[in-house]
Interface confidence: low
């Protein structure tokens, strides 16, 4: 006869490990007992359990409550055992010795591999600002046994670099993702992907990129200069910019205070019915925590087009 076993048994931390040992012999052969031992190169062989055909299972005190026979139905030639709730310390070499009648004794060794799935963590880098050079966006660390694979899934262009630290029974892997911040990256997901044989599927942690920026300011509203004439109602100037964090807007007049009746509402400057007193240089100020911008325009209110005696000025923007 011969022993049917497995060279390598792999189990995830906390699961039950089945250590197989099945004697395949002639129909008239019997298995008297199966002895299980842990084989340690430093500490030698330690008894784990004894499976006797007549007296049943005996477990050594070190493994009490942790070693069982597989559930029924059981074949009398099957000497396999279950090691409950595998821990990392269980990893190593095991031996089964089968005593048969009349063929004698057989033995086989197998290795138990306990996979320790990683628990990844993602740490964002320093605040990102447009105009920076290559900057750390995030780092992702995962520790496990064997060493996990840590990669990044994103549509954002960048570079990734990994380093690993070996511990006695595991390895920690840290991957960093560097990029050159630009406003187009705002709101883009940056996902750390951790792969490991002990995971049913990849673990993913997503960080949403925030890039601080402030766009150049410009002013709309002076496109048609002929609309800016005395008496016109509803004239407005709108300040155009964008930023992260969202910018605040303010309006001033370069050559004095804002004329009475001119109202500031966020990015928009609203005028009452136009008079020549509304002519002047208006400045839009845009700012956020990162920076500030300004854009100025010159408003020249045209004389009433129905009064040909009045001079007609032009509107210009700078």
């Amino acid at each position: 006869g011969e022993l049917e076993t497995s060279d390598l048994v792999t189990v995830v931390l906390g699961q039950d490990a089945k250590l197989p040992c099945f004697y395949r012999g002639d129909p008239d052969e019997q298995v008297g007992q199966v002895a299980w031992a842990r084989v340690d190169p430093n500490e030698g062989t330690r008894e784990l359990a004894l499976l006797h055909s007549k007296y049943g299972l005996h477990v050594s005190p070190a493994y009490e409550d942790r070693v069982e026979q597989p559930p029924p139905p059981r074949d009398p030639l099957d000497g396999s055992i279950l090691l409950r709730n595998a821990v990392q310390a269980d990893e190593g070499e095991y031996e089964c010795r089968v005593s048969t009648f009349p063929a004698g004794s057989f033995q086989a060794r197998m290795r138990l591999r306990v996979l320790v799935p990683p628990l990844p963590s993602l740490n964002p880098g320093p605040p990102l600002e447009e105009g920076q050079g290559l900057t750390l966006a995030a780092s992702c660390t995962a520790e496990g046994s064997p060493a996990p694979s840590v990669t990044w899934d994103t549509e954002v262009k960048g570079t990734q670099s990994s380093r690993s630290f070996k511990h006695s029974r595991s390895a920690a892997v840290t991957s960093e993702f560097h990029l050159v911040p630009s406003r187009s990256m705002n709101g883009q997901p940056l996902t750390c992907v951790v792969s490991h044989p002990g995971l049913l599927q990849d673990q993913r942690i997503t960080h949403t990129l925030q890039v601080a920026f402030l766009a150049e300011a410009s002013v709309r509203g002076l496109e048609d200069q002929n609309l800016w004439h005395v008496g016109r109602e509803g004239a407005t100037l709108k300040c155009l910019s964008e930023g992260q964090p969202p910018p605040k807007y303010n309006w001033t007049r370069l050559d004095g205070p804002l004329p009475s009746g001119v109202r500031v509402k966020g990015d928009t400057l609203g005028f009452p019915p136009l008079t020549t007193e509304h002519s002047g240089v208006y400045v839009c100020h845009v700012s956020n925590e990162l920076s500030s911008r300004a854009s100025q325009v010159t408003v020249e209110v045209l004389a009433d087009p129905e009064d040909p005696g009045k001079q007609v000025d032009l509107v210009s923007a700078s």
Partner: antibody, heavy 118, light 107 residues
Framework: QVQLQESGPGLVKPSETLSLTCTVS????????WSWIRQPPGKGLEWIGY???????NYNPSLKSRVTISVDTSKNQFSLKLSSVTAADTAVYYC????????????WGQGTLVTVSS | DIQLTQSPSFLSASVGDRVTITCRAS??????LAWYQQKPGKAPKLLIY???TLQSGVPSRFSGSGSGTEFTLTISSLQPEDFATYYC?????????FGQGTKVEIK
């Protein structure tokens, strides 16, 4: 030295689909973004779109409804399909590699002229 | 879309001349601008990226400057092999766009 080579039919009938392939040699397609750009005869350049080696894409909105870019990492190739073509799609089509910091097309194919005509 | 306007569209110059080409963006694009050279029947070749960084292998007579909305490409001393069409391109926002080109001809 990475080199790019476009291939595909030089003549396509109106309303049909234009199909081109770009083969990357001298280096791996992995880790970079790859783009298609076209240039009508005697005119300027127009960006069509890009693909990452993992398969994610970004297209020019003016062509988005008609464009598909795909990648085959096992063959080190990426491809362009442009459907419902008209004479206005007649152009030299270039494939190009996007620089690592998203700031330039640093390597270009030599280009292939595709004429749309019945 | 961001429009890039190059000026001039055509430029006649002699060998040894200093040549400057301007590219204006319809809105601020920080320094996300590249310059390419294209000769007839050939693919464009990268000269400058990030507005002012010289691509490896490109002669030092080429230089770029600018930020925001106004950029320039300068050829300090025009050589016979520099007669070509030059394009600027922005990477600040999608869709990425090119200027209409500046053709540098022999005077």
């Amino acid at each position: 030295q990475v080199q790019l080579q476009e291939s595909g039919p030089g003549l396509v009938k109106p309303s049909e689909t234009l199909s081109l392939t770009c083969t990357v040699s001298g280096g791996s397609i992995s880790g970079y973004y790859w783009s298609w750009i076209r240039q009508p005869p005697g005119k300027g350049l127009e960006w069509i779109g890009y693909i990452y080696y993992s398969g994610s894409t970004n297209y020019n909105p003016s062509l988005k409804s008609r464009v598909t870019i795909s990648v085959d990492t096992s063959k080190n190739q990426f491809s362009l399909k442009l459907s419902s073509v008209t004479a206005a799609d007649t152009a030299v089509y270039y494939c190009a590699r996007l620089g690592i910091f998203f700031d330039a097309f640093d390597i270009w194919g030599q280009g292939t002229l595709v004429t749309v005509s019945s | 879309d961001i429009q890039l306007t190059q000026s001039p569209s055509f430029l006649s110059a002699s060998v040894g001349d200093r040549v400057t080409i301007t590219c204006r963006a319809s809105q601020g694009i920080s320094s996300y601008l590249a310059w390419y050279q294209q000769k007839p029947g050939k693919a464009p070749k990268l000269l400058i990226y990030a507005a002012s960084t010289l691509q490896s292998g490109v002669p030092s007579r080429f230089s770029g400057s600018g930020s925001g909305t106004e950029f320039t490409l300068t050829i300090s001393s025009l050589q016979p092999e520099d007669f070509a069409t030059y394009y600027c391109q922005q990477f600040n926002s999608y869709p990425w766009t090119f200027g209409q080109g500046t053709k540098v001809e022999i005077k």
